[in-house]
């Protein structure tokens, strides 16, 4: 516990004090107090450098002396023979002696008292930076006028912080500036600007003049910039040693000016102002930037349009420019878009079509449709080679978007008809010579495919059944051949406007308009044993003459059963209308007179017997295209007869073209549009 | 019309072979296609087997495979199943059928022919 | 092979009745299916083909319905001729094969 005074006397003083004793006193007065330590009493056995016995006084680390010997005042008034005064408020004394003493030493009679010490003048570093004023037991620093005192309580600075400048434009120097500046002072200035404008500081060489740097290079009095995470500086020195246009790149700065103890010059002065955050000019490959300009600051806006062929794409959309926004913090709004190759995606099938599997979808990639060969066509032209355009469509040169269409070939038999022996007379077929054969099994009869839709036939095939059940593909009727074929389901059965629809069609004698379509469900698949026949043309070039050869098929009646299990077929000529009128009818159901004959209907047959007959009906009469020699188009319809194995009547197609167009148009769907 | 004429009853050891003959009447052979099916007695319909004459081949039952034989005699309008290695099992009345048209299974079926196996 | 199971294997009922047989295919048979009158001594009769035509000269109180594995014959009004043994058949492949029976008697 620290002590105003105090004493310290050696061991049995004022007896002799004995032999080899080490014994230590620990001083400590108050805080702010020195020791004034002063001996009245010295009696110990002298030695060089007092080696033997001694009183020793350590201040610190320091030794304040070392006593031995005997000393007497040289004041008759004062007792004092030795005294040490430190400006410190701890001491040490020890006291040691030897083994062996000649004569006998009394040893030391010691007083210690707090004295007041100076902190102003008694030390080599002054404690104040600029007044200190001592007191007992301690010391405070005052500053001069316009000065603080710093929070360590020692410094003065002067109050040069907390301006925070915010206009755009402004000039700040060090303080008195151009005078000296303050010693040991930091001052610091803010400069805010509104986000979107960075500081630009200037400067001019001879406006800046601080204290130089040590021979380290560290400055001592220094001028420092901070913007962000950026510093420009520490500069210091006789003119201004950095850049004298400093573009900070932010809205904020810091400017710190720290000066030390010494060394005071004139100071710095600097101007600065507020431009735009200027925004680089980006190379954002494939697109143009629209307004184009040298250089780009905050709120500036520009379109960046991508190329032709490329498209930008943000979520599942795809557009073809955007806008950028330079922003406050010196970058572009919509920074990640970017224009990116348009994509046309995976092609679109097309129906009875194939398109190869691209090795890119990418702008400018080019693709091609087929069609299922030999059996469809495409109809709407184009070569089906289609290319990635930059709308991200699949472009064909003469189609545009639009997709190619496959349709079935018409009238060409995968194998053409041989007849092989001696219908009625007819020979066995094979249903590739005639794919377009269609059986109806109630009532027993036959139809002809004109397209994937549609199935051509007598009207008085469907008269009595507006359901009717049909196949395609097989050449024997057979059940389990049929099970193995493709069953037709109808839509809607079609007959001509101009057929009499009668109470008791098996006494019928007028044939006239003997054709109806029927509208089938689903489309119906192309194959080898699948294909529609051609319709005729409108030009006279399809007008029958006499002796013209044609094909029919069917199921119909033969010499020797009622009804052919096999496909049969017969190649007749035309004849003259006449030469059925002629014919005797069979059984009839009615006066000969009463049968119509018509310009809409075809007279054929009449040699070796070949003939159609019962169930063969709406089966066609197969003519060769004319202008098309590997085709066959429908010149005609089974229709009726006078008596099998002579000549039969057929349905002059060619008469009702505008009608099956019609038909098939007002009732076609979207599917096949 | 068609008439379908069969051979008669038969009376087999077991091991043995039988070969019933269906002729065909009022018609070609080879207009048609011949199915032959059985029935052991008390039990129900079983089909054997056919000749598919638009590919030419015969297609038999699983069950009967490598046991039955069935072949056509065009110039007779004849049709012949053999069914070999006889079993008790194999006692049944064996008919012969035509295939019908147009959905129709089967047209006319023989009066059939009843074969015993017994030892 | 398509398998055709045939229910109920026996069906005791009166002369008036409505009676109702069906049959289920292992697998889908689209409408190729008949239906057959067997009496004891004679070779089965065919009544119904296409799953639902009526075979010509057999009374209208024969009926068959259905299409891809569900079928059904019925026999609105039983007259005391009907008592029988009816068949199902499917002819959708080559390989024929017949329901196991459904034996119609008197109660």
């Known amino acids: 516990e620290p002590t105003m005074y105090g004493e310290i006397l050696s061991p049995n003083y004022p007896q002799a004090y004995p032999s080899e004793v080490e014994k230590s006193w620990d001083i400590e007065v108050p805080e702010g107090y020195g020791i004034h330590l002063y001996f009245t009493h010295l009696d110990i056995e002298l030695s060089e450098n007092c080696a033997y016995d001694s009183v020793q006084i350590i201040s610190g680390d320091t030794e304040e002396g070392r006593l031995c010997g005997q000393r007497s005042s040289n004041n008759p008034h004062s007792p004092i023979v030795e005294e040490f005064q430190v400006p410190y408020n701890k001491l040490q004394v020890i006291f040691k002696s030897d083994f062996s003493n000649e004569e006998r030493f009394t040893g030391f009679a010691a007083y210690y008292v707090a004295t007041d010490i100076n902190e102003c003048t008694d030390f080599v570093d002054v404690p104040c930076s600029h007044f200190c004023n001592n007191f007992i037991g301690g010391y405070f620093c005052s500053c001069p006028p316009e000065y603080f005192l710093h929070d360590d309580m020692k410094n003065c600075g002067v109050n040069c912080s907390g301006d925070v400048f915010t206009a755009l434009i402004g000039e700040i120097a060090s303080p008195n500036y151009p005078k000296p500046y303050p010693e040991n002072s930091r001052c610091e200035y803010q400069i805010r600007l509104e986000k979107g404008f960075q500081v630009v500081v200037t400067l001019r060489r001879e406006d800046f003049d601080v204290e130089a740097a040590d021979s380290a290079g560290n400055c001592l009095d220094s001028l420092v910039f901070v913007a962000g995470d950026r510093q420009f500086g520490p500069y210091c020195g006789h003119g201004f040693p950095g850049p004298l246009n400093i573009e900070t790149k932010s809205n904020a700065l810091d400017i710190i000016f720290q000066t030390d103890l010494t060394g005071q010059k004139k100071g710095w002065k600097l101007r600065y102002h507020g431009d735009p955050m200027p925004c680089p000019k980006e190379d954002t490959p494939n697109s143009v930037w629209e307004p184009a300009k040298a250089k780009y600051v905050f709120r500036d806006v520009v379109q960046i349009t991508c190329l032709d062929g490329f498209e930008v794409v943000e979520g599942r959309v795809g557009a073809t420019s955007f806008y950028s926004t330079c922003q406050s913090n010196g970058k572009w709004s919509n920074s990640k878009l970017k224009c990116q190759p348009v994509d046309c995606g995976i092609p679109e099938s097309i129906e009875n079509g194939k398109v190869e599997d691209p090795e890119s979808t990418l702008f400018g990639s080019v693709i091609r449709y087929t069609c299922e060969e030999p059996y469809y066509y495409m109809e709407n032209g184009g070569g089906g080679e289609y290319h990635c355009a930059g709308n991200g469509s699949w472009v064909n040169e003469v189609l545009g978007p639009e997709l190619p269409k496959c349709v079935p070939v018409c009238g060409v038999p995968r194998e053409p008809f041989e007849e092989k022996q001696r219908i009625i007379g007819g020979s066995d077929a094979d249903i590739k010579n005639f794919p377009w054969q269609v059986f109806f099994d109630n009532p027993w009869a036959g139809g002809a495919l004109i397209n994937e839709y549609w199935v051509l036939t007598a009207a008085h095939v469907v008269e009595g059944n507006r359901e009717p059940t049909m196949y395609v593909g097989s050449t024997s009727v057979q059940t389990s051949r049929l099970a193995k074929s493709k069953m037709l389901t109808p839509e809607h059965v079609f007959i001509h406007p101009g057929w009499k629809l009668l109470e008791v069609p098996e006494g019928r004698t007028n044939f006239d308009n003997d054709i109806a379509l029927v509208r089938l469900k689903d489309p119906v698949k192309m194959g080898p044993t699948v294909s529609p026949i051609c319709l005729p043309g409108t030009s006279s070039d399809y007008n029958l003459m006499d002796g013209d050869l044609g094909l029919i098929s069917g199921w119909g009646r033969t010499e020797k059963r009622d009804r052919a299990v096999r496909l049969k077929a017969a190649r007749l000529p035309v004849a003259p209308l006449r030469k059925c009128k002629e014919v005797k009818v069979e059984k009839p159901t009615a006066d000969a007179e009463a049968y119509v004959f018509t310009p809409n209907m075809i007279c054929a047959g009449g040699e070796k017997g070949m003939d159609s007959c019962k169930g063969d009906s709406g089966g066609a009469f197969a003519v060769q295209d004319p202008n098309d020699k590997t085709k066959f188009y429908a010149a005609g319809l089974v229709s009726w007869g006078p008596q099998c194995g002579t000549y039969g009547l057929y349905t002059r197609v060619k008469n009702y073209v505008d009608w099956i167009m019609k038909t098939m148009q007002e009732n076609s769907t979207p599917r096949e549009d | 019309q068609v008439q379908l004429v069969q051979s008669g009853a038969e009376v087999k050891k077991p091991g043995a072979s039988v070969k019933v003959s269906c002729k065909v009447s009022g018609d070609t052979l080879t207009e048609l296609s011949m199915h032959w099916v059985r029935q052991a007695p008390g039990k129900g319909l079983e089909w054997m087997g056919t000749f598919d004459p638009e590919e030419g081949e015969t297609i038999y039952a699983q069950k009967f495979q490598g046991r039955v034989t069935m072949t056509e005699d065009t110039s007779t309008d004849t049709a012949y199943m053999e069914l070999s290695s006889l079993r008790s099992e194999d006692t049944a009345v064996y008919y012969c059928?035509?295939?019908?048209?147009?959905?129709?299974?089967?047209?006319?079926w023989g009066q059939g022919t009843l074969v015993t196996v017994s030892s | 092979d398509i398998q055709m199971t045939q229910s109920p294997s026996t069906l005791s009922a009166s002369v008036g009745d409505r009676v109702t047989i069906t049959c289920r295919a292992s697998q889908s048979i689209s409408s190729w299916l008949a239906w057959y009158q067997q009496k004891p001594g004679k070779a089965p009769k065919l009544l119904i083909y296409?799953?639902?035509s009526l075979e010509s000269g057999v009374p209208s109180r024969f009926s068959g319905s259905g299409s891809g594995t569900e079928f059904t014959l019925t026999i609105s009004s039983l007259q005391p001729d009907d008592f029988a043994t009816y068949y199902c058949?499917?002819?959708?492949?080559?390989?024929?094969?017949f329901g196991q029976g459904t034996k119609v008697e008197i109660k």
């Open positions: 059928v035509t295939e019908g048209l147009a959905g129709r299974p089967y047209d006319v």
């Open positions: 296409k799953a639902s």
């Open positions: 058949q499917q002819y959708n492949s080559y390989k024929l094969t």
